[in-house]
């Protein structure tokens, strides 16, 4: 992981660019806490395991979250 260090939050920069759900290995949503006062969304890509910080306020990212949660609810009985 690049630039690992002890900080309250994880993301230095964020992206508005949508991610193809099929290329996602994992999507982490870290809620605001006493350590970091903002929501952070970290997408782990299948290719190379690259991790990206996504903008929680972006419409495209909100749509991605909806798509992923829909997919998850389909899978769960």
């Amino acid at each position: 992981v690049p630039l690992s260090r002890t900080v309250r939050c994880t993301c230095i920069s964020i992206s508005n660019q949508p991610v193809n759900p099929r290329s996602l290995e994992k999507l982490e949503i870290i809620p605001a806490s006493q350590f970091c006062p903002r929501v952070e969304i970290i997408a782990t890509m299948k290719k190379k395991g690259e991790k990206r910080c996504l903008n929680p306020e972006s419409k495209a990212i909100k749509n991605l979250l909806k798509a992923v949660s829909k997919e998850r609810s389909k899978r769960s009985p």
Partner: antibody, heavy 123, light 107 residues
Framework: QVQLVESGGGVVQPGRSLRLSCAAS????????MHWVRQAPGKGLEWVAV????????YYADSVKGRFTISRDNSKNTLYLQINSLRAEDTAVYYC????????????????WGQGTLVTVSS | DIQMTQSPSSLSASVGDRVTITCRAS??????LAWYQQKPEKAPKSLIY???SLQSGVPSRFSGSGSGTDFTLTISSLQPEDFATYYC?????????FGGGTKVEIK
């Protein structure tokens, strides 16, 4: 296109203070981590500080910790570097640079650089 | 801090030459390495990131390779505009650190 324009440099006496600015345009400043990197005359590049996209995280080189403060105003698309207790060894061209942007933790490599502003510390 | 050692510190070459610059990290940095080009009195310009990914708009004669501790920047056919100083930089861990630079001069 991406543009970064630094200002605020000049000749200043040891022990004094200075505030550098970097006006950004051509990209989504409020999404981007930003860095300051400096270069002493005839020398190589030295990373100085980083600030995250909304100003929560700041991180500094040991050589400037406690004397330099990085900050930003996203409403003005402007990055700042407050330099206190200036020393002769702070004489350098100071560049602001954009963070690459999509990597977890920020990548720490730099996409775009400003033209730089020269700070000369001399009595 | 991770030390970055570049070699050579300077080299003379002719237009059309193949030029290779090496960079060694004092400890493993995976592929978290970038290369920059700097011309006199100008700001550095990003050439390569993640050891081998070409920055948008950079000519394909530039290429990067390596991982772990040993890295290479290659210019396949040197052009007049390539005479400059080249820096490597690691971003595996804070603080980001640069090599001392390699000045490519006209033979």
């Amino acid at each position: 296109q991406v543009q970064l324009v630094e200002s605020g440099g000049g000749v200043v006496q040891p022990g004094r203070s200075l505030r550098l600015s970097c006006a950004a345009s051509g990209f989504t400043f409020s999404n981007s981590g930003m860095h300051w990197v400096r270069q002493a005359p005839g020398k190589g590049l030295e990373w100085v500080a980083v600030i995250d996209y909304d100003g929560i995280i700041q991180y500094y080189a040991d050589s400037v910790k406690g004397r330099f403060t990085i900050s930003r105003d996203n409403s003005k698309n402007t990055l700042y570097l407050q330099i206190n207790s200036l020393r002769a060894e702070d004489t350098a061209v100071y560049y602001c640079a954009t963070e690459r942007g999509t990597h977890y933790y920020g990548s720490g490599s730099f996409d775009y650089w400003g033209q730089g502003t020269l700070v000369t510390v001399s009595s | 801090d991770i030390q970055m050692t570049q070699s050579p510190s300077s080299l003379s070459a002719s237009v059309g030459d193949r030029v290779t610059i090496t960079c060694r990290a004092s400890q493993g940095i995976s592929s978290w390495l970038a290369w920059y080009q700097q011309k006199p009195e100008k700001a550095p310009k990003s050439l390569i990131y993640a050891a081998s990914s070409l920055q948008s708009g950079v000519p394909s004669r530039f290429s990067g390779s390596g991982s772990g501790t040993d890295f290479t920047l290659t210019i396949s056919s040197l052009q007049p505009e390539d005479f400059a100083t080249y820096y490597c930089q690691q971003y595996n861990s804070y603080p980001p650190t640069f090599g001392g630079g390699t000045k490519v001069e006209i033979k």
